[in-house]
Amino acid sequence: TPLGPKWPEPVFGRLASPGFPGEYANDQERRWTLTAPPGYRLRLYFTHFDLELSHLCEYDFVKLSSGAKVLATLCGQESTDTERAPGKDTFYSLGSSLDITFRSDYSNEKPFTGFEAFYAAEDIDECQVAPGEAPTCDHHCHNHLGGFYCSCRAGYVLHRNKRTCSALCSGQVFTQRSGELSSPEYPRPYPKLSSCTYSISLEEGFSVILDFVESFDVETHPETLCPYDFLKIQTDREEHGPFCGKTLPHRIETKSNTVTITFVTDESGDHTGWKIHYTSTAQPCPYPMAPPNGHVSPVQAKYILKDSFSIFCETGYELLQGHLPLKSFTAVCQKDGSWDRPMPACSIVDCGPPDDLPSGRVEYITGPGVTTYKAVIQYSCEETFYTMKVNDGKYVCEADGFWTSSKGEKSLPVCEPVCGLSARTTGGRIYGGQKAKPGDFPWQVLILGGTTAAGALLYDNWVLTAAHAVYEQKHDASALDIRMGTLKRLSPHYTQAWSEAVFIHEGYTHDAGFDNDIALIKLNNKVVINSNITPICLPRKEAESFMRTDDIGTASGWGLTQRGFLARNLMYVDIPIVDHQKCTAAYEKPPYPRGSVTANMLCAGLESGGKDSCRGDSGGALVFLDSETERWFVGGIVSWGSMNCGEAGQYGVYTKVINYIPWIENIISDF
């Protein structure tokens, strides 16, 4: 039998009936066997076909077969109901070989010219399958010349049979208190030849509960228990299953915190699998009862392991564990069914006894000693000598535990000394130097420290004085002996004060004139204000209207008197302000250098002389009555004058305090 070409020869060629294109002879049988390379098939088509037609092609025919299968038996010229001619059909081998047999019987009624056919090897597309046939590959099929290969979707691995995709479904660990797990692809059919292991692993103390939901469909067998595909559930205590078939298994209460679920499938079948919803339970903790004036959140029917609750107190109540305050409280349920900490109390906020107010007092408004939430207290300052600064003194115990003013301040109010009070009333006429009476000059301060000088009390812890009076002590403030509340210079009955710091105006130059002759002394303690110790007021912006030429000011001190000795008793003198040009002119002639009187000075005294301040009065206040406020204020500080106090045509020169208000305020606020 003639053989066609064999691979690796090129596989293509022509076949024809014997004698073609002439007629074929009777009793002919010819067989060709064509073989293509593996992964290839043979394609055959006819360019000419003319054979005797007979019923079922019994007489003359061309038979095409591939392996054991007959592909076609051909005769005639055109197909009929029972016979087939090739026409324009193309024929394909089923594998890599094709057998072609030509046979003619003993006679022909007329001459037939036979056939001519061409063949060639071509690649088989193994990925193309006929409808109804099983796909070549489970997931993806890839054709190539001479063959094909399969691959799998993510989450699968190719089985060793090179066609099936097994699910990569092991090693999943579920640690949440509830969740869902299912067979791969659920509710679509699960993969073949797979072995899946799922773990539920909860904290010790939890118990896992398994519920099969929706549908259950795992390949089964009528006689043998789950021989093909099965689901098993394993705990540290027992094994459940195997499960297969179409009935949802019952709930499984595992009484274990760890569960392993195994699902194994074989190579056949088309089943949708299973879905499990799991929950967990644990020993419940005692139901938390909120403390009075508090509430529990969140509210749950029961609280089990890891559940927690917080306590929130009503406004005006605070969380306390005994005496210790808590901003927040959260308790967590433990595995033994106990809470990890005890319930706190929601205690009414207690602001505690209010702080004492220096130079003031506090009164309980709500009730004696009541210091709890919404309680009201009233601060007030000691009458006459103190006044409350920017506050009405009413404080409420607020929810944050602090006494709070109506303006929202948590700091104490301030009792500021009332300034400028004097027992003395002034007249319009000039007196000679007179003895002061108690309460006339309660701001008067005696400064001892090498020399005798004076000053005036500001607020309750500052003294205003002249720079030249304390210049020597500027670096040794503690050397200053400061006395107040007395009229007699040598009296043992006085209020002692000590200096903490001395601030000399930066524009003052010692022994080079008296410009900027001003200083402040900070006391190391506040002094108690009373009728004999009261601060002088600083001038208001409008104060210059009370300090015009010829307006009367009062100077006081223990300085030299007309007898030439320091006064034993505090003396004072009422003197008029002198026109500035007049004063400047008075000190332009020798021995005074030009420019001795500056814009930072004011002058006071009589042209005729006799009324003046003198050595020892330095630093003392020249005061004026503000007729609008009816308070005394400091307009000048005793600074300098003629060598002979009270000399006619000469005047006392005073530091003009109104020019230094910003300087004074800055130092007092900074220190």
Partner: antibody, heavy 115, light 107 residues
């Protein structure tokens, strides 16, 4: 981790003011709890001085109240102790601590009151 | 002030022994009691709060009980590292007060 660290002079003269600071790391003082000062005289037991709470409120041992001030500097996450008019009886190891649900102590700082 | 009276003031026990330290409050302190362990030259370390709640990291051999005025610290099996001074403390009311201490030694 929460850490507390005391700092301040180890020697204070009688009648002066003892000042100590506790620096807290790993937790904000204003977040919660009471921040305490506790002391332990040599060879003796523990004595609570007082606390400042997360909100800035203070509570003092009545036996020391007239001399004690506890304050907080939230910007530095520190709280401080001032004890005025000290005497030899105030010589002790001073601890800062947060008590109850959170319990951490500083390592302690020895303060000697002596002239 | 609430007095916290500890007993005994010192005790000696063998490794493995069960040790009990008691603390009596001069008035009701509910369960607002803590227990501290202090080793020489070290800061106190809290063991128990709210009378019976063990701090995390504290060995389970330490336990506390009691409420009102009578409280107990128990070491179920004494270990060499438990040698220390032990203090009870009440935080029920101002001032917070400590017991005078119990010195625990190994025989």
């Amino acid at each position: 981790e929460v850490q507390l660290q005391e700092s301040g002079p180890g020697l204070v003269k009688p009648s002066q003011t003892l000042s100590l600071t506790c620096t807290v790391s790993g937790y904000s003082i204003t977040s919660d709890y009471a921040w305490n000062w506790i002391r332990q005289p040599p060879g003796k037991g523990l004595e609570w001085i007082g606390y400042i709470s997360y909100s800035g409120r203070t509570s003092y041992n009545p036996s020391l109240k007239s001399r004690v001030t506890i304050s907080v500097d939230t910007s530095k996450n520190q709280f401080s102790l001032k004890l005025s008019s000290v005497t030899a009886a105030d010589t002790a190891v001073y601890y800062c601590a947060v008590l109850y649900a959170l319990d951490y102590w500083g390592q302690g700082t020895t303060v000697t009151v002596s002239s | 002030d609430i007095q916290m009276t500890q007993s005994p003031s010192s005790l000696s026990a063998s490794v493995g022994d069960r040790v009990t330290i008691t603390c009596k409050a001069s008035q009701n302190v509910d369960t607002n009691v803590a227990w501290y362990q202090q080793k020489p030259g070290k800061s106190p370390k809290a063991l128990i709060y709210s009378a019976s709640y063990r701090y995390s990291g504290v060995p389970s051999r330490f336990s506390g009980s009691g409420s009102g005025t009578d409280f107990t610290l128990t070491i179920s099996s004494l270990q060499p590292e438990d040698v220390a001074e032990y203090y009870c403390q009440q935080y029920n009311s101002n001032p917070l007060t400590f017991g005078q201490g119990t010195k625990l030694e190994i025989k």
